[in-house]
Interface confidence: medium
C-alpha cells in the first residue's frame, strides 16, 4: 500500500531513508535538457523474494534534442556529486542495510538524472531526520517518521525534532552552560544524538527498523 503523502517537513531539517521497503517506487526523472528514452521505464520498483531485494527496471535518459539516441546507464561519480536527493550526507552508512529483509539499498545514480529524487513510499517505511548545517536539534535521539495505516488511511507519524539556528541561542552573563548530568544522558545514548554535525545512525538501528526501538510519538 502506497503512502498517500510525503513524509512531514520539519523546519531546517532534511530526511533520508536508510533502506527502502519492497513496493517503493522511484520516478525516472531526467535533468533539464534530457528526457526518458522512448519505451523507457517510468519508475524503478523495489521488488524481491524472501532472501533478496533489488530495484526492477532501469532509468535511462537521453538528450531532448536527439530523438533516437539511447544512452546506456552507467553510474557517473560526477553525477553523484551533483545530485540533490532526499537523503543526507551521513558520516556512517549502515553497512548491512542491503541485507535488511524486504528492503532495497539506495539505487545508484543514472546518467543525466534529475537533481532531486522522487520516491513513492509504502506503508511501514521509516525515514530519519537531521537538522541542516547551522542548526541544532533540541531533542535527543533519532528523529524518525513512519508511514502507518490507520482506519484505512495512511499517515506519517510526526518526528520529534526542533531545529534552531545557533545564532538564536540566548546565553547571559552568569548563566552557565549546564553540563548534562549522568542520569540525564546515559553513555549508551550519546551516539544517538541528532546534531548538525553528527547523524550516526548505528548499524543495529537499520536491523531493527521494522520494530523500532525508539518511539515516534511518546504518548
Amino acid at each position: 500500500e502506497l503512502c498517500d503523502d510525503d513524509p512531514p517537513e520539519i523546519p531546517h531539517a532534511t530526511f533520508k531513508a536508510m533502506a527502502y521497503k519492497e513496493g517503493t517506487m522511484l520516478n525516472c526523472e531526467c535533468k533539464r535538457g534530457f528526457r526518458r528514452i522512448k519505451s523507457g521505464s517510468l519508475y524503478m520498483l523495489c521488488t524481491g523474494n524472501s532472501s533478496h531485494s533489488s530495484w526492477d527496471n532501469q532509468c535511462q535518459c537521453t538528450s531532448s534534442a536527439t530523438r533516437n539516441t539511447t544512452k546506456q546507464v552507467t553510474p557517473q561519480p560526477e553525477e553523484q556529486k551533483e545530485r540533490k536527493t532526499t537523503e543526507m550526507q551521513s558520516p556512517m552508512q549502515p553497512v548491512d542495510q542491503a541485507s535488511l529483509p524486504g528492503h532495497c539499498r539506495e539505487p545508484p545514480p543514472w546518467e543525466n538524472e534529475a537533481t532531486e529524487r522522487i520516491y513513492h513510499f509504502v506503508v511501514g517505511q521509516m525515514v530519519y531526520y537531521q537538522c541542516v548545517q547551522g542548526y541544532r536539534a533540541l531533542h535527543r535521539g533519532p528523529a524518525e517518521s513512519v508511514c502507518k495505516m490507520t482506519h484505512g488511511k495512511t499517515r506519517w507519524t510526526q518526528p520529534q525534532l526542533i531545529c534552531t539556528g545557533e545564532m538564536e541561542t540566548s546565553q547571559f552573563p552568569g548563566e552557565e552552560k549546564p553540563q548534562a548530568s549522568p542520569e540525564g544522558r546515559p553513555e549508551s545514548e550519546t551516539s544517538c544524538l541528532v546534531t548538525t554535525t553528527d547523524f550516526q545512525i548505528q548499524t543495529e538501528m537499520a536491523a531493527t527498523m521494522e520494530t523500532s526501538i525508539f518511539t515516534t510519538e511518546y504518548q
Epitope: 512531514p8 517537513e9 520539519i10 523546519p11 541544532r136 536539534a137 533540541l138 531533542h139 535527543r140 535521539g141 510526526q158 520529534q160 525534532l161 526542533i162 534552531t164 539556528g165 538564536e168 541561542t169 540566548s170 546565553q171 548563566e175 552552560k177 549546564p178 548534562a180 542520569e183 540525564g184 544522558r185 511518546y218 504518548q219
Partner: antibody, heavy 116, light 107 residues
Amino acid sequence: QVQLVESGGGVVQPGRSLRLSCAASGFTFSNHAMAWVRQAPGKGLEWVAVISYDGSNKYYADSVKGRFTISRDNSKNTLYLQMNSLRAEDTAVYYCTTGWNSGYDWGQGTLVTVSS
Amino acid sequence: DIQMTQSPSSLSASVGDRVTITCRASQSVSSFLNWYQQKPGEAPRRLIYGTNSLQSGVPSRFSGSGSGTDYTLTISSLQPEDFATYYCQQYTSWPWTFGQGTKLEIK
C-alpha cells in the same frame, strides 16, 4: 499518559522574583525539549522560552530576555522558570509544554500576578 | 519576528454551520503552521499541524489549508463543543508566534 503540572505561581510585587516549576511524567523527560508559554488575562498566547533536552540551548522571547531564565533538572523530571525583575505586564497564566514543533502536551497552567 | 494576524477576531455561528477562520503571516512560514483550540479555563489543544495534518483524536470536520503567508482553518459542520477560541501559530523560526485568536460564539 503525559502529565505536566505547574506550580509556584502567586501574587508578587513589581521588581521581585518568582520561580515556577513544572513536574513532568509519562514520557522520557530527558529526551525532550520543553517550553513555557504564557497568556495574560483575556489575551492571546505568547511563547516565553524553550530549552533543549540537556539544557545546553535556551531561547527566549525578547520581552523576557535578560530577566527570565529557563532551566531543567533531568534527574527530577522538572522544568523551571526563574523570573526576576517582574513587571505588571508579566501577569499571566504560565503553561509548561513539550516544546517540539507544536506544543503538543500542556499543563493546566499556574497564575502569576504582578501587582503592588 | 513573524507577525500572525487572524480574521475575524470574533465570529457568531450556529450548530451545523460551515466556518472558516483565516490567518495571515507577515512573511512566508512555509506551511509550518499549527491551529489550536482553547476553551475558557483550559489549556490550548492542538488541532492541526503542518497546515493540514489532523492531530490524532481530532474530529475530521476540522481541516486546514494554505501556503506561503495565507492559511485557513475550516470547520465543516459546527458542533456545540466547537464554540471556543482558535489560534494559529507559526513554527518556522524562533520566536514562534501565535495569532491574536478568533473567538467563535453561538449565534
